[in-house]
């Protein structure tokens, strides 16, 4: 499955939108930094079949979409930017879903790569727990925004490697 060129442009647009979403000076949030334990090894792309990598990417985008679709997220970010960001993620999910079906067939996808998908889910659980503990403060969201930018960059790099394998 070849992800369309518009997919990588969508990645870039999503990162730009996320960068634009900042509302407070990040410098005031230094003490709120937190180790979310991003599962970097799941995104190095070496040990995966293409289908497995796509399923992990899909989970990453899905969880990001879920995180930024909550009521708490709506209260934290400028609405039009948030909507544009969600739209970009939604389009990426559609592209990746089409690819997953093409690569492995519908029957196999739920069983694929469960450990990696679980690692991504636990990572997002840690992010949600952090936000809850910090009472969804502006700085907590700022730290999470920085973290998601970093993790989406890893996702983008994995997608680039997948395209080079084609």
């Amino acid at each position: 499955c070849d992800l369309p060129q518009t997919h990588s442009l969508g990645n870039r647009r999503a990162l730009i939108l996320l960068a634009q979403m900042g509302r407070i000076s990040h410098f005031s949030c230094l003490k709120d930094r937190h180790d979310f334990g991003f599962p970097e090894e799941e995104f190095d792309g070496h040990q995966f079949q293409k289908a497995q990598a796509i399923s992990v990417l899909h989970e990453m985008i899905q969880q990001t979409f879920n995180l930024f679709s909550t009521e708490d997220s709506s209260a934290a970010w400028e609405q039009s930017l948030l909507e544009k960001f969600s739209t970009e993620l939604y389009q990426q999910l559609n592209d990746l879903e089409a690819c997953v079906i093409q690569e492995v067939g519908v029957e196999e996808t739920p069983l694929m790569n469960e450990d990696s998908i679980l690692a991504v889910r636990k990572y997002f659980q840690r992010i949600t727990l952090y936000l809850t503990e910090k009472k969804y403060s502006p700085c907590a969201w700022e730290v999470v925004r920085a973290e998601i930018m970093r993790s989406l960059s890893f996702s983008t790099n994995l997608q680039k490697r997948l395209r080079r394998k084609d």
Epitope: A19, H26, L30, D35, A146, E147, M149
Partner: antibody, heavy 121, light 107 residues
Framework: EVQLVQSGAEVKKPGESLKISCKGS????????IGWVRQMPGKGLEWMGI????????AYSPSFQGQVTISADKSISTAYLQWSSLKASDTAMYYC??????????????WGQGTLVTVSS | DIQMTQSPSSLSASVGDRVTITCRAS??????LNWYQQKPGKAPKLLIY???SLQSGVPSRFSGSGSGTDFTLTISSLQPEDFATYYC?????????FGQGTKVEIK
């Protein structure tokens, strides 16, 4: 390979202006902040300030606020430190270093080679 | 501002010695402390970040510990290339601040 390359040594007279540079390569320049650190001859390290090149937001140490200006041009992956009127006491080695911002990652993991600024009449 | 106080300011040691440098913050900084090594005429080099994480490529004889206000850098067996000045730096809040440095010299 990540690199921060600083501009060359400068010899200036008191009252003159100066702008030194720090060019980043081998990484996404806007994903990291750039900090500036002063080291006067035979002395320790002093943090001066920092910039987020993605939006040019800055923070300064109170000791350096109003004395220097930090800026960045993300189109050429370069951060700057400038003085409008140098003093003899500005004579020092100046280092730039990258900072991961709000991410949980090593602070100041890569440094420039330093720019020696000498101010003398 | 958070003040960082290192001790000792200098020490003499021999190759193979275990060396300990301490750093104290004027208020709690959780675990947001970094250690750097600097040799004459060179830029500082990050050794330890977030109090105890060893920076990639740094020998395992270097270790860091502590949290709150009291921190320690330990060199388990001093090597000839370890003679340098060491700085702690709080990474908890702006303005970032460094300790005054500890010079490790050959006995």
């Amino acid at each position: 390979e990540v690199q921060l390359v600083q501009s060359g040594a400068e010899v200036k007279k008191p009252g003159e202006s100066l702008k030194i540079s720090c060019k980043g390569s081998g990484y996404s320049f806007t994903s990291y902040w750039i900090g500036w650190v002063r080291q006067m001859p035979g002395k320790g390290l002093e943090w001066m300030g920092i910039i987020d090149p993605s939006d040019s937001d800055t923070a300064y140490s109170p000791s350096f606020q109003g004395q220097v200006t930090i800026s960045a041009d993300k189109s050429i992956s370069t951060a700057y430190l400038q003085w409008s009127s140098l003093k003899a006491s500005d004579t020092a080695m100046y280092y730039c270093a990258r900072h991961p911002g709000l991410n949980w990652a090593p602070d100041f993991d890569y440094w420039g080679q330093g720019t020696l600024v000498t101010v003398s009449s | 501002d958070i003040q960082m106080t290192q001790s000792p300011s200098s020490l003499s040691a021999s190759v193979g010695d275990r060396v300990t440098i301490t750093c104290r913050a004027s208020q709690s900084i959780d675990g947001a402390l970094n250690w750097y090594q600097q040799k004459p005429g060179k830029a500082p080099k990050l050794l330890i970040y977030f109090a105890s994480s060893l920076q990639s490529g740094v020998p395992s004889r270097f270790s860091g510990s502590g949290s709150g206000t009291d921190f320690t850098l330990t060199i388990s067996s001093l090597q000839p290339e370890d003679f340098a000045t060491y700085y702690c730096q709080q990474a908890y809040d702006f303005p970032l601040t460094f300790g005054q440095g500890t010079k490790v010299e050959i006995k």
